[in-house]
Interface confidence: low
């Protein structure tokens, strides 16, 4: 039966943030896992998609993600289906809205001494806490003449008088975050001497070196004063401009013009209106400098024909928010069709080979325009230009097998030898065009070879059999110099291979025939009993019909193998005395003697004054020291034979004689007396 290892559970989520509904299933057979929302299947989108068996939300949406989610597992083989527990999101959100007049029904009906109720259209979950502002100053609940009802999000002024005039805004905050009114309400209750807002300045975004205009108008009787301040409270007038606002002009109607705007001009501008009576009205607006960053590079994309693919263009950071559009071949893409733009995405449905090319994502705002190209390749299945052919390759020479294909993008070619992938090494090389080179063909290269040419769209393969044309050769070649032991039996082998089995025979280099005690048996020269006369030059001849003959020359030497007449003995010597290690060998040719002491050959030319090797082979060491202790090896060798024998040398301190010991007492061990 299908078992849920993990089931989705109801959880809190934040609007626009990530979330995950977990679902893990265990079943005896394969299962399909899908999701329902209020009983209807959930289709994957970039925002909400299946991730394994779980459902992942890149950005929770309070409208699209409200309802009951359920994970369903179905075994298509048996028809068995399992459904998880229901799960839903408690989505926390906050959304800005305007301040609107709730009572009276219209602004025209507002009169002094009437009740005025404003509503803050900021909504959210959980219900946010509201704060009201007049001209940017917070209104605390319980102040004279106004009440705040957080439940209804209302501000009630009763009765409303000229002192309540101003720009009303609200902000709200909750566990999710904070939002302020998107549009504020200007309440104007006539006290002719109070300054009233006629035109409030708006935030502006301008490009560098462009001009910015803030409009600001107040009305009152008598006319009010109007003053502009920049961030640092510096007044701006046509007579006295701060150094960084040299290009500012204040017009008679209150508008402020800034020309050739620079970064230092960005900031908050305050327009202050003061009537004969009443509080000053302070209106704020911010000047932002337009900016646009660079766009990230696109990786080239390879798509397959018939598929649907999307390429997302991440707009660069910028102010104002850059607009994004896609172009291909200089033409802006439509918002519907087969190749179209959807949001910031380039969508290619049912891709055709002709869709390949460069597509450009453009982003622009007041600060300028950025663009980034993406190269789209439509992969095709490779087609054959030249398949590998069954081939006869000559041993020892380079061999080539073709695998020539064409496709977009350039296909990748791999070769297999006996179903095993060939990795390039000193013997095998795959050229850019797919051809395989076997650098020096060997007999065991005769087998099946298969090449596979692939692109993301698919692959093709073909195989060919290689037959190796074996060269006529000795296997192995006979050693050119060989020794035979005098008066003993000896054999000299000679074997060869070729395309046809070769015939092998021996003859003496001078052409004379082999004596009767020497036989040539299928290439093996056999000496029943070696004599001095058997020494000399011999030739092994291997031949076959198609390849002719080859010859190998062997010089046979007859030797008496080395034996030791005298071997060195285990020797103990007092420190400071002389050690003699005797060694004498015999053989024909006469052997030479070398000594090895403490794992290094003792070179007679570099022995120094303390050591000497005699003509007969013996080694003498004068004035021995403890470091001379160790194993000494006598090596006897001639052109035919080498033999060695070894013995240890011990160097000991000379004992101090005790009084009880007489002068004739023997030493405690066998010594060389010198």
């Amino acid at each position: 039966a299908i078992v849920f290892i993990k089931q989705p559970s109801s959880q809190d989520a934040l609007q626009g943030r990530r979330a995950l509904l977990r679902c893990e299933v265990e079943a005896p057979g394969p299962v399909h896992v899908y999701w329902l929302l209020d009983g209807a299947p959930v289709q994957d989108t970039e925002r909400r998609f299946a991730q394994g068996s779980s459902l992942s939300f890149a950005a929770v949406d309070r409208l699209q993600d409200s309802g009951t989610f359920q994970c369903v597992a179905r075994d298509d083989v048996t028809g068995e289906e399992a459904r998880s527990a229901n799960a839903s999101f408690n989505i926390k959100w906050i959304e800005a809205g305007p301040v609107v007049l709730k009572h009276p029904a219209s602004e025209a009906e507002i009169q002094p001494q009437t009740q005025v109720t404003l509503r803050c259209h900021i909504d959210g979950h959980p219900r946010p806490t509201y704060q009201w502002f007049r001209d940017g100053t917070p209104l605390s609940d319980g102040q004279s003449n106004h009440t705040v009802s957080s439940k209804e999000r209302n501000l009630t002024l009763r009765p409303a008088g000229p002192e309540h005039s101003g720009l009303y805004s609200c902000c709200a905050h909750s566990a999710f975050g904070q939002a302020c009114s998107s549009q504020n309400f200007t309440l104007s209750i006539a006290d002719e001497s109070f300054a009233r807002v006629v035109l409030a300045p708006q935030d502006v975004v301008v490009a560098r070196y462009e001009e910015a205009m803030f409009h600001c108008q107040f009305s009152a009787q008598p006319p009010p004063s109007l003053q502009w301040l920049f961030e640092d409270e510096t007044p701006i007038t046509n007579r006295s401009r701060p150094p960084h606002l040299r290009r500012a002009t204040v017009f008679a109607n209150g508008s402020l013009l800034l020309t050739q705007v620079r970064p230092r001009n960005a900031g908050i501008y305050r327009c202050i209106g003061q009537g004969q009576r009443g509080p000053p009205i302070i209106l704020e607006a911010t000047l932002h400098l337009a900016e646009i960053e660079d766009m990230p590079l696109f990786e080239p994309r390879v798509f397959t024909a018939g598929s649907e693919e999307r390429v997302t263009c991440l707009p660069p950071k910028g102010l104002p928010e850059p607009s994004v559009w896609w172009e291909h071949a200089g033409v802006r893409l439509p918002t519907h069709g087969r190749v179209y733009q959807k949001g910031h995405e380039l969508v290619l449905a049912n891709i055709a080979e002709s869709d390949a090319g460069v597509y450009t994502c453009h982003a622009a705002n007041l600060a300028g325009q950025r663009r980034q190209d993406v190269n789209i390749t439509v992969a095709t299945v490779p087609s054959w230009l030249k398949k590998p052919q069954d081939s006869q390759l000559e041993e020892g020479k380079p061999g080539y097998l073709d695998c020539l294909t064409q496709a977009t993008p350039k296909p990748t070619v791999v070769w297999y030898r006996n179903q095993m992938l060939i990795s390039e090494d000193s013997r095998f090389e795959v050229f850019k065009n797919g051809t395989l080179r076997i650098n020096s063909v060997e007999v065991y290269d005769g087998t099946w070879y298969r090449c596979m040419s692939s692109t993301p769209a698919g692959s093709i393969e073909a195989q060919a059999r290689v037959q190796v044309l074996e060269k006529l050769k000795f296997t192995p070649p006979p050693q050119p110099q060989q020794c035979m032991e005098f008066d003993k039996e000896a054999t000299v082998p000679c074997s060869a291979t070729g395309r046809e089995k070769p015939t092998i025979k021996w003859e003496r280099a001078d052409g004379s025939s082999l004596p009767e005690w020497v036989t040539d048996n299928a290439g093996t020269l056999h000496f029943a009993r070696v004599t001095r006369d058997d020494a000399g030059n011999y030739t092994c001849i291997a031949s076959n019909g198609p390849q002719g003959q080859i010859r190998a020359h062997v010089q046979l030497t007859v030797a008496v193998f080395i034996t030791f007449k005298v071997e060195p003995e285990r020797t103990t010597v007092y420190q400071g005395h002389t050690a003699l290690l005797q060694c004498e060998a015999q053989g024909d040719p006469k052997p030479l003697i070398q000594w090895k002491g403490k794992d290094r050959i003792l070179d007679p030319t570099k022995l120094g004054p303390r050591m000497h090797i005699f003509q007969n082979g013996s080694l003498v060491i004068h004035d021995v020291a403890p470091e001379d202790s160790g194993r000494y090896t006598c090596i006897a060798g001639n052109s035919c034979n080498i033999k060695h024998t070894e013995a240890p040398l011990y160097v000991v301190d000379k004992p101090v004689p005790e009084e009880s010991e007489g002068p004739g007492s023997p030493p405690p061990y066998k010594m060389i007396q010198t």
Epitope: A1, G29, V77, T78, G79, E81
Partner: antibody, heavy 112, light 107 residues
Framework: EVQLVQSGGGLVHPGGSLRLSCAGS????????MYWVRQAPGKTLEWVSA???????YYADSVKGRFTISRDNAKNSLYLQMNSLRAEDMAVYYC??????WGQGTLVTVSS | DIQMTQSPSSLSASVGDRVTITCRAS??????LAWYQQKPEKAPKSLIY???SLQSGVPSRFSGSGSGTDFTLTISSLQPEDFATYYC?????????FGQGTKLEIK
């Protein structure tokens, strides 16, 4: 084409044993849940046993301890080893893959 | 074990008739119900699975409905080849059990 070919039915004495085989072809045998279902003459269908792709086994109470279901995925074969057979075990035995595919049936006769 | 009770046990009808067979489970089985058709000396043939899903290759005149404990099989317009015995089967839990069958005969 999915095919289930059954063999191994026949006459057996009460208390005797019989082994039924079912050879599957035309599908990836190792990934499917397999059943044995039987039908006594003139009676309804009776589910006998099931074996999962992982080798997990299930039996009807009436056959538990006497029948053994097994599978050899390498041979694409399903088996039912029936021991201690009784007269009430006499039926046509069907092997089935899921709901949709059934073998041709094989008759098991238990009689003295 | 879950008992499956089919009704009626036999039914006579004519070609072109609309026929309904019901099946009741002794306990809730969600939609884990299949319907089979069996003709003499033949293996059963699956018609409906998951209570209402038509097996591929089965004519659309066959339909199934119900969930929980009560289910129906409907043949909208009887054809000569539809005269057979029909069984319901629950596969909600082991041991899987069948109804006793409904024999549909020509009137």
């Amino acid at each position: 084409e999915v095919q289930l070919v059954q063999s191994g039915g026949g006459l057996v004495h009460p208390g005797g044993s019989l082994r039924l085989s079912c050879a599957g072809s035309g599908f990836t045998f190792s990934t499917y849940l397999m059943y044995w279902v039987r039908q006594a003459p003139g009676k309804t269908l009776e589910w006998v046993s099931a074996i999962g792709s992982g080798g997990d086994t299930y039996y009807a109470d009436s056959v538990k301890g006497r029948f053994t279901i097994s599978r050899d995925n390498a041979k694409n074969s399903l088996y039912l080893q029936m021991n201690s057979l009784r007269a009430e075990d006499m039926a046509v035995y069907y092997c089935a893959r899921g709901l949709g595919y059934w073998g041709q049936g094989t008759l098991v006769t238990v009689s003295s | 074990d879950i008992q499956m009770t089919q009704s009626p046990s036999s039914l006579s009808a004519s070609v072109g008739d609309r026929v309904t067979i019901t099946c009741r489970a002794s306990q809730g089985i969600s939609s884990w119900l299949a319907w089979y058709q069996q003709k003499p000396e033949k293996a059963p043939k699956s018609l409906i699975y998951a209570a209402s899903s038509l097996q591929s290759g089965v004519p659309s005149r066959f339909s199934g409905s119900g969930s929980g404990t009560d289910f129906t099989l409907t043949i909208s317009s009887l054809q000569p080849e539809d005269f057979a015995t029909y069984y319901c089967q629950q596969y909600n839990s082991y041991p899987y059990t069948f109804g006793q069958g409904t024999k549909l005969e020509i009137k």
